[in-house]
């Protein structure tokens, strides 16, 4: 009975040619969609001239099919029982699942202006950049199409910089025809309890972005976990999108297409300040914006983004401290809509449904030397967009799962 099932599971979740897990792992059978909501700024002039609160109105969803490409450069290493791979990036726009087209226009923060003023705090460099910003007729805000904002555009200000800088800017630029990795994960042949756990990422066991244990690459990539998941477990996983490892805790039992799954959620504690959760002390990397590490709910990932002042949060600043959102009007955080969850089939450890939600923000600060930022009287963590990446096991796959896994156990 149980021993036979355990033996079968242990055999079939190993990441090697011929197993059920491997086939689905190489190229996911689940359709994964990434929905974007863009924060359209309603009062750009008032913000720039009077340092008013930024009034935003979210527009979306704009939906893309993602993660449809098979893993590349899959290489087994029998010596240490690992398999390495690249995860190619690709996004296909889905008009039928979107409120508009990729040509829709949005008023958003000028990414290049905000980033340049942060990367180059030196007054002389800023005054040089200011002359180029003025010459290019750039401002604090800009109007961009969805396609430009997400996937990249040639910035007029950066095009005037007479030094070798990349003139292309976009929230996810470059994306298509790029790959995430190399990941090297345990294949589970020697110990099934390690299957899918990341050994190294980009050839290293650490990220070099954080101090101490915050810098560790923990757990899996969240697509699956070692089998026989217990409700009491804290599931660790690494997300390259947020440049850190994070964790999920059990919330509830869920029935997904007749399959009993455990819903694991990212708890608010994971986003807490070091004051509330001392474990998070090494995710606080500066003292000013974080108000001496008392702010919570935003993560400064600038070190992972070539110095660009990118802050990651949950959508609408869910679980964030009031000081973070006090400069922004029009946000409505809602736990049901804006939290991240993973629905895990506990026997196999496979994630059969998930919703990964995150918001990308950019810090903009007053600058005495950049005219378009001169009138600002305070710092703003400006929401640019939030995304909801979802995947649910298909009906056929669910049927197969019911018959081959859960059915056999019941």
């Amino acid at each position: 009975g149980d021993m036979l099932i355990q033996k079968t599971i242990k055999k079939e979740v190993v990441l090697e040619e011929g197993t059920i897990a491997f086939k689905n792992w190489v190229k996911t059978g689940t359709e994964i969609y990434r929905q974007f909501w863009i924060f359209d700024v309603q009062n750009p002039q008032e913000v720039m001239m009077n340092s008013s609160n930024i009034q935003v109105k979210q527009r979306g969803p704009y939906t893309y099919r993602v993660r449809f490409l098979a893993k590349e450069n899959i290489t087994q290493d029998p010596k240490d029982n690992t398999v390495s791979f690249l995860q190619p990036n690709g996004a296909i726009f889905e008009p039928s699942l979107s409120v508009g087209t990729e040509a829709d226009n949005f008023t958003v923060l000028n990414l290049a202006v905000a980033a340049a003023s942060h990367i180059y705090p030196n007054p002389f460099v800023q005054v040089v950049l200011n002359s180029l910003i003025n010459k290019s007729k750039s401002s604090m805000f800009q109007v961009r199409t969805l396609r430009e904002l997400l996937w990249g555009y040639t910035d007029p200000f950066l095009s005037l910089v007479p030094y070798p800088v990349s003139t292309r800017v976009g929230m996810f630029y470059p994306y298509n025809n790029t790959a995430d990795g190399v990941y090297k994960v345990f294949n589970g042949k020697d110990s099934i309890s390690k299957v899918a756990i990341i050994d190294t990422y980009k050839g290293k066991r650490n990220l070099s972005y954080w101090e101490s244990y915050c810098d560790m690459i923990n757990g899996t990539d969240a697509a699956s976990f070692p089998p026989f998941v217990e409700k009491s477990q804290v599931l660790q996983f690494f997300s390259s999108d947020i440049c850190r490892s994070i964790y999920a805790v059990f919330e509830s039992d869920v029935n997904l297409k007749g399959i009993p799954v455990y819903r694991f959620v990212l708890p608010s504690k994971a986003f807490a300040s070091p004051v509330q959760n001392p474990d998070n002390h090494c995710f606080c990397t500066e003292k000013i914006i974080s108000k001496n590490c008392t702010s919570y709910g935003v993560l400064d990932i600038s070190k992972c983004k070539e110095g660009k002042p990118v802050y990651i949060s949950l959508p609408h600043f869910l679980y964030a401290s009031p000081d973070v959102s006090e400069t922004i009007d029009g946000l409505n955080p809602n736990e049901e809509e804006h939290r991240t969850y993973l629905d895990i089939e506990p026997i196999t450890g496979f994630t059969l449904q998930f919703a990964k939600r995150l918001q990308v923000n950019l810090l903009v600060k007053p600058s005495n030397k950049i005219q378009v930022l001169k009138r600002l009287k305070r710092n703003y963590i400006v929401p640019i967009l939030w995304l909801n990446e979802t995947g649910t096991i298909g009906d056929e796959k669910a049927k197969m799962f019911r018959s081959q896994v859960t059915g056999k156990i019941n």
């Epitope: 030196n122 007054p123 002389f124 460099v125 005054v127 040089v128 200011n130 002359s131 003025n134 030094y163 005495n368 030397k369 005219q371 001169k374």
Partner: antibody
């Protein structure tokens, strides 16, 4: 005390070139932005060129028409101004000046000056 | 380019009197005005930097006010050692531009 010593000035004919140097006694020279400023015979002060601490950013007013090149050698703690196609209107006392907005002194432009080196352009 | 108009071109004042020099800019430069003193045979010396900030070691009789386009530099009780040329400099935008200078003499 900050000491800046300019050299390389002299009498040249129109169309000729000249290279000015400015030596600093400061250990922290590589941390500071620098400029060349000139004082004309009419006693007008004009910014000629500026360069940031690592030499990555330079600036020239349009009026200089790219005839001048500012550079620096941080290992030698020296600032340079290569001047070409010199004209009579370039006749001036050329000063090198260090910007002083380190340690949060924002906007202390041309905080320290050398004694200057005289450039005379005449046929 | 921001032009800076400095007045007067020269000034003859008695010891102990209050000296005022004015600079007007062609564009709004907030408070990005600087003031320099140049004595004969010496390089210019920065007295007051952006934000009407008196530089360390500069006597408190020197001061400046102004914001936007109109700026005034003052010496409260003129001393004989204050005889010099005085220049204003706008540092709001490139190219930084100097005023034409004011020659201060003793009456």
């Amino acid at each position: 005390e900050v000491q800046l010593v300019e050299s390389g000035g002299g009498l040249v004919q129109p169309g000729e070139s000249l290279k000015l140097s400015c030596e600093s006694n400061e250990y922290e020279f590589p941390s500071h932005d620098m400029s060349w400023v000139r004082k004309t015979p009419e006693k007008r002060l004009e910014l000629v060129a500026a360069i940031n601490s690592d030499g990555g950013y330079t600036y020239y007013p349009d009026t200089m028409e790219r005839r001048f090149i500012i550079s620096r050698d941080n290992t030698k703690k020296t600032l340079y101004l290569q001047m070409s196609s010199l004209r009579s209107e370039d006749t001036a006392l050329y000063y090198c000046a260090r910007h002083g907005y380190d340690y949060d002194e924002e906007g202390a432009w041309f905080a320290y000056w050398g004694q200057g080196t005289l450039v005379t352009v005449s046929a | 380019e921001t032009t800076v108009t400095q007045s007067p071109a020269s000034l003859s004042m008695a010891i102990g009197e209050k000296v005022t020099i004015r600079c007007i800019t062609s564009t709004d430069i907030d408070d990005d005005m600087n003031w320099y003193q140049q004595k004969p045979g010496e390089p210019p010396k920065l007295l007051i930097s952006e934000g009407n900030t008196l530089r360390p070691g500069v006597p408190s009789r020197f001061s400046s006010t102004g914001y936007g386009t109109d700026f005034v530099f003052s010496i409260e009780n003129m001393l004989s050692e204050d005889v010099a040329d005085y220049y204003c400099l706008q540092s709001d935008n490139l190219p930084f531009t100097f005023g034409s200078g004011t020659k201060l003499e003793i009456k």
